[in-house]
Interface confidence: medium
């Protein structure tokens, strides 16, 4: 069908609550484009009827609420005047009862659900709520170990929980809760956040933390487009360089002629005492020579790699 495939990162989500994903790919969606969502390679688009539990809302796919059976690969097709891109998003839904410690830990949570507070400082946690304009979010409530937070050191500011004079006891499991209203119906959103405490490093001595990748392999088909984010937390005043390298060479230099593999533009989200940086690597077309090579994300003295590997053969197809 002439659409270029782009594989985005997995999203791990909690069942029985609203979830939304926005189909944006800045190089493409900045112009005049149409966006259509599909599930599991279905030829039938996701409904645009707002009464449907799963429906498309402008460029978003919206689940009201998400259910355990909604796991799967969703595609959004972005069609421009002269282009077509199909973005694949793998959604994994899990049943998590935040206050039931017997169920065990969470699966590999994304960086939004792992946050850091700095010992002895005033700092903040952020409740990440990404929904289309049609969803109205009420005031956020915060919980620690399933008890609502009401202490004198805590103040709520929009989507943030401000924490005064952070202490070691502030580490642990937090949750932020909001009531979402859509078409007159109300839903509860509850995000769990695992909080660790770090001492602020001295002058120039900060060690960045690479949240993702985690020295692992990624299965990817030959010939596809692949984008991988490197997510790094670091102090606000850091001077560390963040980049992707292969064979100890900057990817932009290594692939200078073909430009087949490129490093993206770095972005960051500012928290009170630290920044979350993202710099991606884009494989315009995965080639055989890319498999087995460690592609390294560097952040100051910290490094982490990904290795591309061919997917195992699917014998069910024969």
């Amino acid at each position: 069908d002439g659409c270029k495939d782009i594989f985005m990162k997995n999203e791990i989500l909690s069942a029985s609550q609203p979830f939304a994903f926005n189909c944006t790919f800045p190089p493409i969606t900045s112009g005049e484009v149409s966006v259509t969502w599909y599930k599991n390679s279905s030829k039938i688009p996701v409904s645009k009827i707002i009464q449907s539990r799963i429906h498309q809302d402008e460029t978003w796919i919206l689940f009201l609420p998400m259910e355990w059976g909604d796991s799967g690969v969703y595609q959004c097709v972005i069609k421009g005047r002269d282009s077509c891109h199909r973005i694949h998003v793998n959604l994994t839904v899990f049943e998590k009862h935040w206050c039931d410690t017997s169920i065990g830990g969470l699966p590999n949570l994304s960086d939004e659900y792992k946050q850091i507070l700095h010992l002895g400082k005033d700092d903040s946690l952020t409740c990440h709520l990404h929904f289309p304009k049609s969803c109205v979010l009420g005031p956020i409530k915060w919980y620690k170990d399933c008890n609502e937070i009401k202490g004198e050191r805590f103040t709520v500011l929009e989507t943030r929980l401000l924490v005064s004079n952070v202490s070691a006891e502030d580490r642990g499991n937090y949750a932020c809760q909001a009531i979402l209203t859509h078409s007159g119906k109300q839903y509860e959103v509850l995000n769990g956040i695992t909080v660790s405490i770090t001492e602020r490093a001295g002058y120039g001595g900060s060690v960045p933390k690479i949240i993702y990748p985690k020295n692992h392999s990624i299965e990817v088909q030959l010939g596809t487009t692949l984008i991988v984010d490197c997510n790094v937390t670091d102090t606000k005043d850091n001077t560390n360089l963040r980049c992707w390298r292969v064979n100890n060479t900057l990817v932009d230099d290594y692939y200078d002629e073909s430009k087949r593999i490129r490093e993206g533009v770095e972005t960051h989200v500012s928290f009170r005492e630290h920044n979350l940086y993202t710099v991606n690597i884009t494989f315009l077309e995965v080639k055989m020579e890319d498999y087995g090579l460690p592609f390294m994300c560097h952040a100051g003295v910290s490094t982490a790699y990904i290795i591309l590997q061919l997917p195992a053969p699917d014998f069910r197809a024969y």
Partner: antibody
């Protein structure tokens, strides 16, 4: 000891920009946030916004489009600007800082500066 | 936003008598409440933080109580210097909000 002092013109014409400076001493702006609060002639107090120790800012919703807060750490000064003023912005403007321990919210205040909006 | 409502607007009391000022929050703010005293031409002066703790240098005749939505400032035996305007403020949730004030005047 900790001190804050507001300065700026006492009279501003309608539709103009109100500009105030808060000069601090006894502490560093890299360690503490500075808040701006105003008090109307009818005595009511209203929180306007804050500049945090890292230089980021937050504002009360009605002010988001009109207020700018910045700071010059080397000069120990915080700058406050309120654009498109009307007579409703006539008030005493304060800068304030939290105390050094939790819960001790505005433990330190400037003396306040009366700003009258009039043509 | 959280609305803080103070009562009464004016309280006329004789020196040496106990004065009780009330402050109600429109939603639960825990104990994240402050009380200030303000005299004409001066900035507010913090008296009580966390609903019941006195700031340093505040005389023991000032006490605060309450949690959730109802708070009280009590001055056990009024001195002449206590006649002033009193404000409560919540810091549970931004925007930070203040009560409209109670004027304590000499009867």
């Amino acid at each position: 000891q900790v001190q804050l002092q507001e300065s700026g013109p006492g009279l501003v014409a309608p539709s103009e920009t109100l500009s105030l400076t808060c000069t601090v001493s006894g502490f560093s702006l890299t360690d503490y946030a500075v808040h701006w609060i105003r008090q109307f002639p009818g005595k009511g107090l209203e929180w306007i916004g804050v500049i945090w120790s890292d230089g980021s800012t937050d504002f009360n919703a009605p002010f988001k489009s009109r207020v700018t807060i910045s700071k010059d750490t080397s000069k120990n000064q915080v700058s406050f600007k309120l654009s498109s003023v009307t007579t409703d912005d006539t008030a005493v403007y304060y800068c304030a800082r939290k105390g050094g321990y939790s819960g001790s919210w505005f433990a330190y205040w400037g003396q306040g500066t009366l700003v009258t909006v009039s043509s | 936003e959280i609305v803080m409502t103070q009562s009464p607007a004016t309280l006329s009391v004789s020196p040496g008598v106990r004065a009780t000022l009330s402050c109600k929050a429109s939603q639960d703010v825990g104990t994240n409440v402050l009380w200030y005293q303000q005299k004409p031409g001066q900035a507010p002066r913090p008296l009580i933080y966390s609903a019941s703790y006195r700031h340093s240098g505040i005389p023991a005749r000032f006490s605060g109580s309450g949690s959730g939505t109802e708070f009280t400032l009590t001055i056990s035996s009024l001195q002449s210097e206590d006649f002033a305007e009193y404000y409560c403020q919540q810091y549970s949730r931004y925007p930070l909000t203040f009560g409209q004030g109670t004027k304590l005047e000499i009867k």
